[in-house]
Interface confidence: low
C-alpha cells in the first residue's frame, strides 16, 4: 500500500468508556496532530476512514457501520457507539486520505464494566475543593455533544453508593453539585448519572470523579523552613560525616511548583568540587500540604568544608525563603599529657 503519515498509537489518549453506555470519540488527528479541522479537510476532498484491531488480535478490520439500530456510526470526525459492548475494546484508527495525501493515528479504547456502586477500573479525574472556603461546585464532566440542548436530561448524583439527598452541605443542582462548605469528610468518589431519551430509546451516561478537599488559599503561607534553624549547630571533626536536613513545610497551592534546594558558598552543590549527595523525601497532610526534606550529606568532611556556607532555599507560588545552617569545626578535647602539662609549665 502507498505511504501514509502514521502517527502511531496515541497512548496519551487512553480512552475508557462504560459498557452499555453511549460513547462519542473524536478522531485525534484533528485535535492533536494536524493543523486543520475536519470541515476544512472534508471540503478539500479528503475522506475520513475508520478501522480497528480487536483486543489480542493483529488483524486490522473495517468497522461495521451496518449493525442493527445503527449501534456504531460516524458523524463528521466522531465515532459513535449507541451503546458500547465489552467486545468493542481494541485499538481504533482514523485515517484521512485522498489520492495524494494520507495521515492516520491509532488510539486504544477500553470498554469497562462497573458494579452497582460505580466501582470500576476506570481512571478517575480528581477535583480539588478548598477546605472551609464557601460554596464550590463540581460539574458532571464529558457529557457535551451527547444530546441536543432541546433535550432535558435527568441527573442523579451519588456519593459512593448513596444517592445524594438531604445531605447537610452537598446539594445537587442539575449538572452541578454544590458544596456549601467543604470538609475532609467530603473526600470521596462522586458519580452523576445522566439519563436522556433518543429515538425512542433511553440512554445513561455515568461519570465518576474523585473529590479531594485541600488547603484553602486563605490559609496559605510562604514556605516555612523548620530545619536548619538557630537551635541546632552542626559541629564536626574533619573526616566525620556531615548530615544536614532541610525540612520545609509548604501550604497547598493549586498548580504551585514547590522547590527545595541547597547552595554551598552560594553555588549549586554540583558546581562545587566536593562529594555531596542530596536525598529528598516528601510527605503530605490530609489537605495536601507538603513537607519536603532534603538531606545534604558529605561522607568525609574536610576542615575547608566546615568553613563553607550551607544554605537551604525553598520556593512556592507564595514566595521564596532561605535559611543558613550553622556549621562549625569541633575543637578537639585537650590531651592531658601534652596540652595541660604545657599549661602548667612542665618541661
Amino acid at each position: 500500500s502507498e505511504r501514509c503519515d502514521d502517527w502511531g498509537l496515541d497512548t496519551m489518549r487512553q480512552i475508557q468508556v462504560f459498557e452499555d453506555e453511549p460513547a462519542r470519540i473524536k478522531c485525534p488527528l484533528f485535535e492533536h496532530f494536524l493543523k486543520f479541522n475536519y470541515s476544512t479537510a472534508h471540503s478539500a476532498g479528503l475522506t475520513l476512514i475508520w478501522y480497528w484491531t480487536r483486543q489480542d488480535r493483529d488483524l486490522e478490520e473495517p468497522i461495521n457501520f451496518r449493525l442493527p439500530e445503527n449501534r456504531i456510526s460516524k458523524e463528521k470526525d466522531v465515532l459513535w457507539f449507541r451503546p458500547t459492548l465489552l467486545n468493542d475494546t481494541g485499538n481504533y484508527t482514523c485515517m484521512l486520505r485522498n489520492t495524494t495525501y494520507c495521515s492516520k493515528v491509532a488510539f486504544p479504547l477500553e470498554v469497562v464494566q462497573k458494579d452497582s456502586c460505580f466501582n470500576s477500573p476506570m481512571k478517575l479525574p480528581v477535583h480539588k475543593l478548598y477546605i472551609e472556603y464557601g460554596i464550590q461546585r463540581i460539574t458532571c464532566p464529558n457529557v457535551d455533544g451527547y444530546f441536543p440542548s432541546s433535550v432535558k436530561p435527568t441527573i442523579t448524583w451519588y456519593m459512593g453508593c448513596y444517592k445524594i439527598q438531604n445531605f447537610n452541605n452537598v446539594i445537587p443542582e442539575g449538572m452541578n453539585l454544590s458544596f456549601l462548605i467543604a470538609f475532609i469528610s467530603n473526600n470521596g468518589n462522586y458519580t452523576c448519572v445522566v439519563t436522556y431519551p433518543e429515538n425512542g430509546r433511553t440512554f445513561h451516561l455515568t461519570r465518576t470523579l474523585t473529590v479531594k478537599v485541600v488547603g484553602s488559599p486563605k490559609n496559605a503561607v510562604p514556605p516555612v523552613i523548620h530545619s536548619p534553624n538557630d537551635h541546632v549547630v552542626y559541629e564536626k571533626e574533619p573526616g566525620e560525616e556531615l548530615l544536614i536536613p532541610c525540612t520545609v513545610y509548604f501550604s497547598f497551592l493549586m498548580d504551585s511548583r514547590n522547590e527545595v534546594w541547597w547552595t554551598i558558598d552560594g553555588k549549586k552543590p554540583d558546581d562545587i568540587p566536593i562529594d555531596v549527595t542530596i536525598n529528598e523525601s516528601i510527605s503530605h497532610s490530609r489537605t495536601e500540604d507538603e513537607t519536603r526534606t532534603q538531606i545534604l550529606s558529605i561522607k568525609k568532611v574536610t576542615s575547608e568544608d566546615l568553613k563553607r556556607s550551607y544554605v537551604c532555599h525553598a520556593r512556592s507560588a507564595k514566595g521564596e525563603v532561605a535559611k543558613a545552617a550553622t556549621v562549625k569545626q569541633k575543637v578537639p578535647a585537650p590531651r592531658y599529657t601534652v596540652e595541660l602539662a604545657c599549661g602548667f609549665g612542665a618541661t
Epitope: 493543523k35 486543520f36 478539500a44
Partner: antibody, heavy 119, light 108 residues
Framework: QVQLLQSGAEVKKPGSSVKVSCKAS????????IDWVRQAPGQGLEWMGG????????NSAQKFQGRVTITADKSTSTAYMELSSLRSEDTAVYYC????????????WGQGTMVTVSS | EIVLTQSPGTLSLSPGERATLSCRAS???????LAWFQQRPGQAPRLLIY???RRATGIPDRFSGSGSGTDFTLTISRLEPEDFAVYYC?????????FGGGTKVEIK
C-alpha cells in the same frame, strides 16, 4: 527548529509581477498553513492570504484577489507568493509566516523580502 | 471583516514602568483567536501571546494578555530596555485575518 528563509530583495517596474519564495527547513511543511503578510514603509501589518500545502488551495484577502497567487511545492518545502499588476503602493516588506501547530497563530516568520516598485 | 483598533497610538514610559496596551474589535473574536506581536525596528514580528492569554514559547512572564469578546489587553508588568518596540494585535479566528494599527512603546 523550523526556519523560514525568504528570497532576496526585488526592484520592479509598475505593471510587472513579483514572485517571492519562502523555504521551510527543519520541520514538517505540508500540514501547517503558510501565510503572507506585508508591511509598507512606516505602516502596519496587512494579511494577504495563505495556503495549507497538503491541500494546495489558497485563500486570500478580497483586496488582493485576482492579483495574488499563493502556491506551495511540497517536494521542496517552499511556498510562493506572486503579486501581479504592481503599483507603487505595493512597495513593502513581504513576510511569510507559519500558522503554528499548537497556537494557530503566526509562531514563525521569515526574515522578510523588500519589494520596491518604481519606474 | 473584523476591524481591530489599538490604543494608544504611542505610549511613552520609562524602564521599570508598567505598560497597558488596548485592542478593541469591531465584532466578537471567535474562539478567542487573538494574538499579540512585538516588532523591533528592521526585524520581523515576533509572537508574544496567542489565544488571548497564552504566552508563546520563550516569552518572559512579564508579558501577559487578557480580555474576551471585543476588548483585549496586553500588559508588560515591568518594561525592560528591549521591550521598547511596536506591538500589534491580530485576530485569526475569521477570514480575512486582520491586524490592529499598532502601539509604539517608546522611552520617555
Amino acid at each position: 527548529q523550523v526556519q523560514l528563509l525568504q528570497s532576496g530583495a526585488e526592484v520592479k517596474k509598475p505593471g510587472s509581477s513579483v514572485k517571492v519564495s519562502c523555504k521551510a527547513s527543519g520541520g514538517t511543511f505540508s500540514i501547517y498553513a503558510i501565510d503572507w503578510v506585508r508591511q509598507a514603509p512606516g505602516q502596519g501589518l496587512e494579511w494577504m492570504g495563505g495556503i495549507i500545502p497538503i491541500f494546495g488551495t489558497a485563500n486570500s484577502a478580497q483586496k488582493f484577489q485576482g492579483r495574488v497567487t499563493i502556491t506551495a511545492d511540497k517536494s521542496t518545502s517552499t511556498a510562493y507568493m506572486e503579486l501581479s499588476s504592481l503599483r507603487s503602493e505595493d512597495t513593502a516588506v513581504y513576510y511569510c509566516a507559519r500558522n503554528g501547530a499548537t497556537s494557530d497563530a503566526f509562531d514563525m516568520w521569515g526574515q522578510g523580502t523588500m519589494v520596491t516598485v518604481s519606474s | 471583516e473584523i476591524v481591530l483598533t489599538q490604543s494608544p497610538g504611542t505610549l511613552s514610559l520609562s524602564p521599570g514602568e508598567r505598560a497597558t496596551l488596548s485592542c478593541r474589535a469591531s465584532l466578537s473574536v471567535s474562539s478567542n483567536y487573538l494574538a499579540w506581536f512585538q516588532q523591533r525596528p528592521g526585524q520581523a514580528p515576533r509572537l508574544l501571546i496567542y489565544g488571548v492569554s497564552r504566552r508563546a514559547t520563550g516569552i518572559p512572564d512579564r508579558f501577559s494578555g487578557s480580555g474576551s469578546g471585543t476588548d483585549f489587553t496586553l500588559t508588560i508588568s515591568r518594561l525592560e530596555p528591549e521591550d521598547f518596540a511596536v506591538y500589534y494585535c491580530q485576530q485569526y479566528g475569521s477570514s480575512p485575518l486582520t491586524f490592529g494599527g499598532g502601539t509604539k512603546v517608546e522611552i520617555k
